[in-house]
């Protein structure tokens, strides 16, 4: 079941999925001046069996100005960004991507990929939040959001990470705690 909405945005933070549940789709988007090849896939799909998950289909872009055929996939990490996120300042890795059964790793970039990735998440997907540069976590509460099915509708849980600037934090006495880890999680409301 696809999640109806995007993960929630919260002030001064970005989110990222560490691994993608089977059923997740990634749009094949090309950067300005390029387009999908005529016979190319609209999206990549995370699929798998009990022992292995991987991305089906390949995204391929060609110049809009020519009728060239396919371009080979070559890594361009600087192009690789996720939907509605910015690159993380530090490796926010609460789980090893390869160790999660039923999940795909981050797909490798393709040549002339658009600068933002558009994912379509499924129920059960978890995304992790981190404060942007210049802000820090007020507390090490849960910094993730999970797409849940409640009363027949999908919704994302509210991340409990609060990111404050240095000036703001100084008003509030109390020990500053390190960045969130995935131990305590906001769970779904009681089901119907």
């Amino acid at each position: 079941e696809l999640c109806d909405d995007d993960p929630p945005e919260i002030p001064h933070a970005t989110f990222k999925a560490m691994a993608y549940k089977e059923g997740t789709m990634l749009n094949c988007e090309c950067k300005r001046g390029f387009r999908r090849i005529k016979s190319g896939s609209l999206y990549m799909l995370c699929t798998g069996n009990s022992s292995h998950s991987s991305w089906d289909n390949q995204c391929q872009c060609t110049s809009s100005a020519t009728r060239n055929t396919t371009k080979q996939v070559t890594p361009q990490p600087e192009e690789q960004k996720e939907r509605k996120t910015t690159e993380m300042q530090s490796p926010m890795q609460p789980v090893d991507q390869a160790s999660l059964p039923g999940h795909c790793r981050e797909p490798p970039p393709w040549e002339n990929e658009a600068t933002e990735r558009i994912y379509h998440f499924v129920v059960g997907q978890m995304v992790y939040y981190q404060c942007v540069q210049g802000y820090r976590a007020l507390h090490r509460g849960p910094a993730e959001s999970v797409c849940k099915m409640t009363h027949g509708k999908t919704r994302w849980t509210q991340p409990q990470l609060i990111c404050t600037g240095e000036m703001e934090t100084s008003q509030f006495p109390g020990e500053e705690k390190p960045q969130a880890s995935p131990e305590g999680r906001p769970e779904s409301e009681t089901s119907c």
Epitope: I10, G174, G184
Partner: antibody, heavy 116, light 107 residues
Framework: QVQLVQSGAEVKKPGESLKISCKGS????????IVWVRQMPGKGLEWMGI????????RYSPSFQGQVTFSADKSISTAYLQWSSLKASDTAMYYC?????????WGQGTLVTVSS | DIQMTQSPSTLSASVGDRVTITCRAS??????LAWYQQKPGKAPKLLIY???SLESGVPSRFSGSGSGTEFTLTISSLQPDDFATYYC?????????FGQGTKVEIK
């Protein structure tokens, strides 16, 4: 469904102590910030601060720092707001809400009246 | 703290009117703004979050707009149930702050 149920109205004298409660149900109470909000008679809403029930981490608005104390008992899904010495100016309706950003669920409020 | 100022303080209107309430922040809060409705003797109710996102179950006649320092709450066609006090709240800069409220009363 998500519910926050607050303790009943209180009438106190200046100088007395008081502890009011807010019990959550229908969600993982320990893992959501609880926000306390004050509303003095005929006035607007004031953000007092927050508590994270899982470890009782508290943050107070500068206006309320040192005036009140937040606490929580996650084993019974309850947050508390207390005063050690009430003043007449503490007379107000006090709400607990689920945070941390905007408040999607609110308690019904506890009316505290302080009068000699 | 960021100061939130609402205008007008009181607004007289009739059923069916289009009503607009303004909230101004003393500095930019991006889109991190919520709107609440409160009726006498009741707890506030969330209407809008992130400046323009309608909370689940809230009628579509309510809408929010704006970013930075100026925001508006619009009720497209005022209903009898909408006579209440409305508050804005910023949650961009810790600690969060509310506007002083706008009372919508019957003309």
């Amino acid at each position: 469904q998500v519910q926050l149920v607050q303790s009943g109205a209180e009438v106190k004298k200046p100088g007395e102590s008081l502890k009011i409660s807010c019990k959550g149900s229908g969600y993982s109470f320990a893992n959501y910030w609880i926000v306390w909000v004050r509303q003095m008679p005929g006035k607007g809403l004031e953000w007092m601060g927050i508590i994270y029930p899982d470890d009782s981490e508290t943050r107070y608005s500068p206006s309320f720092q040192g005036q009140v104390t937040f606490s929580a008992d996650k084993s019974i899904s309850t947050a508390y707001l207390q005063w050690s010495s009430l003043k007449a100016s503490d007379t107000a309706m006090y709400y607990c809400t689920r945070g941390p950003y905007y408040s999607d669920y609110w308690g019904q409020g506890t009316l505290v009246t302080v009068s000699s | 703290d960021i100061q939130m100022t609402q205008s007008p303080s009181t607004l007289s209107a009739s059923v069916g009117d289009r009503v607009t309430i303004t909230c101004r922040a003393s500095q930019s809060v991006s889109s991190w703004l919520a709107w609440y409705q409160q009726k006498p003797g009741k707890a506030p109710k969330l209407l809008i979050y992130k400046a323009s996102s309608l909370e689940s179950g809230v009628p579509s006649r309510f809408s929010g707009s704006g970013s930075g320092t100026e925001f508006t709450l619009t009720i497209s066609s005022l209903q009898p149930d909408d006579f209440a006090t409305y508050y804005c709240q910023q949650y961009s800069s810790y600690s969060w702050t509310f506007g002083q409220g706008t009372k919508v009363e019957i003309k």
